[in-house]
């Protein structure tokens, strides 16, 4: 079968949001994937979207984030843009109302999207072929 | 665990000048964003300053931009805060501070009080 398109629009945001960093990519979040044995994929794809969320509904307006110059502001606009993209489409992929998160291991938003980045080109390259 | 120790705090004149300094420890220092933040006497928490693990992008606050700067030593884990021409109004607890999931984590914080 073919890839979902919804999964080249994830692969295609996660390549926007890795490439760049912003004064607050190294912020935590929860480390959803350290401890990811006996969870689906759509479980795996739910929990990354509510963490993603967390993440952006509470630093959407967080000052050091914002920045002090243009380019900052910019730049983080354009993140939180992303990431809510990234959140609708994984909720459109995992197909779940709600999943619990444990807040346990912590990981700083960069590697936590480029972990998502590695799992969803694996999962691409196996539907591809 | 989670350590952060501030100090280098005290009593300045206006137009004087401090070092804070932040001793981090309990987690790999080189690999995240740490910040300054402070809370005046009866005000809110302010965040002062931000800088990322590379010390390469920073965020100053408008109130203290120009006479602050933020700074970072990844080999000794320590994180800097040198305050210039400190005015009466800068006097307040001062926090060195790290993200930690949807929070912050503080330290106990070091008093700054600038007063002729």
């Known amino acids: 079968h073919k890839c979902d398109i919804t999964l080249q629009e994830i692969i295609k945001t996660l390549n926007s949001l890795t490439e760049q960093k912003t004064l607050c990519t190294e912020l935590t979040v929860t480390d959803i994937f350290a401890a990811s044995k006996n969870t689906t994929e759509k479980e795996t794809f739910c929990r990354a979207a509510t963490v993603l969320r967390q993440f952006y509904s509470h630093h959407e307006k967080d000052t050091r984030c914002l920045g002090a110059t243009a380019q900052q502001f910019h730049r983080h606009k354009q993140l939180i843009r992303f990431l809510k993209r990234l959140d609708r489409n994984l909720w459109g992929l995992a197909g779940l109302n709600s999943c619990p998160v444990k807040e346990a291991n912590q990981s700083t938003l960069e590697n936590f999207l480029e972990r998502l980045k590695t799992i969803m080109r694996e999962k691409y390259s196996k539907c591809s072929s | 665990e989670v350590q952060l120790l501030e100090s280098g705090g005290g009593l300045v004149q206006p137009g004087g000048s401090l070092r804070l300094s932040c001793a981090a420890s309990?987690?790999?220092?080189?690999?995240?964003?740490m910040g300054w933040a402070r809370q005046a006497p009866g005000k809110g928490l302010e965040w002062v300053s931000w800088i990322i693990s590379s010390g390469t992008e920073t965020y100053y606050a408008d109130s203290v931009k120009g006479r602050f700067t933020i700074s970072r030593d990844n080999s000794k884990n320590t994180l800097y805060l040198q305050m210039n021409s400190l005015r009466a109004e800068d006097t307040a607890v001062y926090y060195c501070?790290?993200?930690?999931?949807?929070?912050?984590?503080f330290g106990q914080g070091t008093l700054v009080t600038v007063s002729s």
């Open positions: 501070a790290k993200s930690l999931g949807r929070f912050d984590y």
């Open positions: 309990g987690f790999t220092f080189r690999n995240f964003g």
